[in-house]
């Protein structure tokens, strides 16, 4: 079907304007014929017939509405993420991980410490199993809750004597100033203990152990 | 605009039936006026002329089809929070919080050591200042990584003298077995101290805090 | 001092903490509202095709039937 | 007085402040899906608007013209 | 040999694991609301277009042929 | 035994934590994201109807009059 | 009414082990920790250990530390203290008592009537 | 660690007040407890918290505490009175039980 169209005539007796014509179908013809449509430029009661192009410009509003709220709210959220304006406290809540299930989770790092003694090698690989690494100490100021911990406990750093080296499990080099190493007993691997301090203990002594994992 | 419907006639030579007539308009005028529309039943070359009614049948199979994929989209996001099956380790990996940005999450609580020492009225008003509390220690299973904090620190608890109990700032009376406590000096104020031990101290001595916070 | 020298302990968690149920960004009246919107606009749509939709019918069109190049039917 | 004088101590802890029962859930391949999904549903909704809206001339509709009652135009 | 021997240690920490920064918020009572309104809403779109789009067929409109100029019809 | 024992240290860190990296996964740059396709899409679907809509006026057709049976002016 | 009941002692080498016992009764025995205390012939009051009341903590003097263990088994209502590496200084009659306080660690409430320990060869 | 001192013995004529003292470091910030042995017997609480009293135990005995020096009062001393009285505090810090050296309260 198409629109019904001709071209103007000087002869008026030969054409009628449809002026007073009402094209249009029954009603619930039109309901369900013209949906979303945009009334052609006809001289037509558009408005009162429903017209498709009325009908089209409200679902354009109505999708422009829709348009305007989503992005109002969207923004209400990106805002919200921005400044959360909930909390008092600077920089907003926020969540911390992921962590394995109930590990400590601090400044995005997940820290678990595990009461059962074991050797250097079996902490490792308790900590592997579950996706983790012996504790890494990368920085004082990302790691302050480490000085409040109590006791010994392995961490992953190893003893290359090859050049005298400390060196964690990922390969890097110990930096300087960030633990103080004493010696407990001779040995290739450290103990972590409070305040960042580091104690040499041999690989096979059983002792509690600290998994670490990275999430930034 | 209208549809142009007349009724049918005997008389062959009054009337044409528009099998063979076109009455579309350009096509670009069709294609910008007569959007999501069904088409009427009449014979004509509905398919090839982009019906309305195809074309509005297009648009509810593709609406059906948004529907399907947001269903399946939104239940995939559901059922991942019911099990998420992504993560290797029992119960998968989860985040922990909401807490104050830098704060220490453990299993949904949020914690912070503060250096400087206050007495128990200022250290209280820090926490509260952070919407938070002094530490109120109420389960040993849910709270394990206190075991391992070294120092004494203030926590929410005050004894009753009237009836000689102690008390969390709530005002719950503290459940016997959870901490031991121990006077350090004559006081109505609690440190807590590693593996559940309270010391009493003078409220007004000046101590290192735990503030915290209970999500859950 | 002691702790009974202060009349009362200050009043304590005045809200919760951050409210956020479970979520800086995404609280739960934020997506409450997000839901109740998208809600909305989809009835705004709907809405208004039955609106539009509804039929007018002008005086003239009483059979729902077009006559052409009948001027004394206008 | 000490603190036992006080009747009560303040209202502590009145509500949650989250749960995060099953964080994680949204994870960046899940959002980047849904936001695919719902770009792709939405750019099919535009694209079946062009795509059935598109012209297809029939051979005998040269001009755009319809012309009534004229068999020889057939 | 100690760990010297070895060239290197295991790569470690290949790739982050999450940032988070606003989560949880969707708790499964919320993503099922959330999910259940989408349904809704879409179904009631997409049955609004097959309700509105039903044909009614007029008595008289046995053919679906159009005839013009048929006055005595009327 | 020192780790010097072992050949090598197990690989670790296979794959990172529990994948969904970057949760919270509504971070700011995901969520800007997001808001930018849902008004994209948003405006793709706006605009279209308005382009679709928009009336093309053919030279001839001055005063949005329609007339019939003039074959003269065909 | 509090009754706390001491057993277990006895005669024994410089080097063995003793095992003591207190059953308790009339109270909630799980709440309180325990102490035991020793006076040695002629001498004053001298407190050995104390185990709290869920048992997870435990205290010893300096002189005891490493040789003694306390314990307690709150389904019997009775605490113990193991003896090992026992020395002649060690001779004492042993009091177990139960601590005033329920949370706290403070004073001794409730004695028992002791049970004499004697290392000698 | 932490030292209690008491004097050895005190001596008192029946119906006056006896007073038996002991002696720390700052004992006023601690809390003091005071226990009676007679010859024979298992020690009893006596004053509990530097001066309250357990259910049972005479009004006669009474508590203070401050500076340098705690102090267990017994008025109108009795014969039966006659007993070994032992002071005992916490030390928080080194989480030890300390008791006097015991004091022989001798009624004349």
């Known amino acids: 079907m198409g629109w019904i169209r001709g071209r103007r005539s000087r002869h008026s007796w030969e054409m009628s304007e449809f002026h007073n014509y009402n094209l249009d179908l029954k009603k619930s013809d039109f309901s369900t014929r013209w949906q979303k449509q945009r009334c052609p430029v006809v001289k037509s009661k558009c408005r009162e017939n429903a017209s498709p192009f009325f009908f089209c410009c409200f679902i354009a509003v109505a999708m422009g509405i829709r348009f305007i709220i989503m992005v109002t709210i969207w923004s209400a959220v990106f805002l919200n993420s921005l400044f959360n304006q909930e909390v008092q406290i600077p920089l907003t809540e926020s969540y911390c991980g992921p962590c394995p299930k109930n590990w400590i989770c601090y400044k995005n790092n997940c820290y678990q410490f595990f009461d059962e003694s074991k050797n250097w090698y079996e902490s490792q690989a308790s900590c592997m199993s579950q996706n983790a690494s012996l504790l890494k100490v990368y920085s004082k100021e990302d790691q302050d809750l480490l000085k409040l911990v109590k006791s010994y406990h392995w961490m992953g750093l190893v003893h290359i004597p090859t050049n005298g080296s400390w060196q964690w499990e990922d390969g890097s080099i110990l930096s300087p100033n960030l633990l103080t190493i004493i010696e407990m007993q001779k040995g290739d691997c450290a103990l972590y203990a409070s305040s960042f301090k580091g104690y040499i203990e041999n690989c096979s002594t059983p002792n509690t152990y600290i998994c670490m994992q990275r999430t930034v | 605009m209208g549809w142009i419907r007349g009724r049918r006639s005997r008389h062959s030579w009054e009337m044409s039936e528009f099998h063979n007539y076109n009455l579309d308009l350009k096509k670009s005028d069709f294609s910008t006026r007569w959007q999501k529309q069904r088409c009427p039943v009449v014979k004509s070359k509905c398919r090839e002329n982009a019906s309305p009614f195809f074309f509005c049948c297009f648009i509810a199979v593709a609406m059906g089809i948004r529907f399907i994929i947001m269903v399946t989209i939104w239940s995939a996001v559901f059922l991942n929070s019911l099990f998420n099956q992504e993560v290797q380790i029992p119960l998968t990996e989860s985040y922990c919080g909401p807490c104050p940005k830098n704060w220490i999450c453990y299993k949904n609580n949020c914690y912070q050591f503060f250096d400087e020492s206050k007495n128990w009225y200022e250290s209280q008003a820090s926490c509260m200042s952070q919407n938070a509390s002094l530490l109120k220690v109420y389960s040993k299973e849910d709270q394990d990584l206190l075991k391992l904090v070294k120092s004494y620190h203030w926590m929410g608890l005050v004894h009753i003298p009237t009836n000689g109990s102690w008390q969390w700032e709530d005002g719950s009376i503290l459940s016997p077995n959870l901490l031991t406590i121990i006077e350090m000096q004559k006081g109505d104020c609690a440190l807590y101290a590693s593996s559940f031990k309270g010391y009493i101290e003078n409220c007004s001595t000046p101590n290192t805090y735990i503030c915290m916070q209970r999500t859950v | 001092t002691t702790p009974g020298e202060r009349s009362s302990l200050p009043a304590f968690y005045p809200g919760t903490s951050g409210s956020c149920s479970g979520c800086g960004s995404l609280s739960l009246p934020l997506l409450a509202g997000l839901v109740a919107a998208d809600a909305v606009a989809s009835l705004l749509i709907v809405g208004a095709v039955f609106l539009c939709a509804r039929p007018r019918r002008s005086p003239a069109q009483e059979d729902g039937k077009v006559y052409i190049n009948m001027p004394g039917r206008g | 007085t000490t603190p036992g004088e006080r009747s009560s101590l303040p209202a502590f802890y009145p509500g949650t402040s989250g749960s995060c029962s099953g964080c994680g859930s949204l994870s960046l391949p899940l959002l980047a899906g849904l936001v695919a999904a719902d770009a792709v549903a939405s750019l099919l909704i535009v694209g079946a608007v062009f795509l059935c809206a598109r012209p297809r001339r029939s051979p005998a509709q040269e001009d755009g013209k319809v012309y009534i009652n004229m068999p020889g135009r057939g | 040999t100690t760990p010297g021997e070895r060239s290197s240690l295991p790569a470690f920490y290949p790739g982050t694991s999450g940032s988070c920064s606003g989560c949880g918020s969707l708790s499964l009572p919320l993503l099922a609301g959330l999910v259940a309104a989408d349904a809704v809403a879409s179904l009631l779109i997409v049955g609004a277009v097959f309700l509105c789009a039903r044909p009614r067929r007029s008595p008289a409109q046995e053919d679906g042929k159009v005839y013009i100029n048929m006055p005595g019809r009327g | 035994t020192t780790p010097g024992e072992r050949s090598s240290l197990p690989a670790f860190y296979p794959g990172t934590s529990g994948s969904c990296s970057g949760c919270g996964s509504l971070s700011l740059p995901l969520l800007a994201g997001l808001v930018a396709a849902d008004a994209v899409a948003s405006l793709l679907i706006v605009g279209a109807v308005f382009l679709c809509a928009r009336p093309r006026r053919s030279p001839a057709q001055e005063d949005g009059k329609v007339y019939i049976n003039m074959p003269g002016r065909g | 009414e509090v009754q706390l009941l001491e057993s277990g002692g006895g005669l024994v080498q410089p080097g063995g082990s003793l095992r003591l016992s207190c059953a308790a009764s009339?109270?909630?025995?799980?709440?309180?920790?325990m102490t035991w205390v020793r006076q040695a012939p002629g001498k004053g009051l001298e407190w050995v250990s104390i185990?709290?009341?869920?048992?997870?903590?435990?205290f010893y003097a300096d002189s005891v530390k490493g040789r003694f263990t306390i314990s307690r088994d709150n389904s019997r209502n009775t605490l113990y203290l193991q003896m090992d590496s026992l020395r002649a200084e060690d001779t004492a009659v042993y009091y177990c008592?139960?601590?005033?306080?329920?949370?706290?660690?403070?004073?001794?409430?409730?004695w028992g009537q002791g049970t004499l320990v004697t290392v000698s060869s | 660690s932490y030292v209690l001192t008491q004097p050895p013995s005190v001596s008192v004529a029946p119906g006056q007040t006896a007073r038996i003292t002991c002696g720390g470091n700052?004992?006023?910030?601690?809390?003091v407890h005071w226990y009676q042995q007679k010859a024979g017997q298992a020690p009893v609480l006596v004053v509990y918290?530097?001066?309250d009293r357990p259910s049972g135990i005479p009004e006669r005995f009474s508590g203070s505490n401050s500076g340098n020096t705690a102090t267990l009062t017994i008025s109108r001393v009795e014969a039966g009175d006659e007993a070994d009285y032992y002071c005992?505090?916490?030390?928080?810090?080194?989480?030890?039980?300390?008791f006097g050296g015991g004091t022989k309260l001798t009624v004349l």
């Open positions: 009339g109270f909630t025995f799980s709440i309180y920790a």
């Open positions: 008592a139960k601590e005033g306080k329920w949370v706290q660690l403070s004073h001794f409430a409730n």
């Open positions: 005992q505090v916490w030390d928080g810090r080194s989480d030890h039980v300390v």
């Open positions: 918290d530097d001066s």
């Open positions: 700052n004992i006023g910030s601690k809390s």
């Open positions: 185990i709290s009341g869920s048992g997870d903590h435990t």
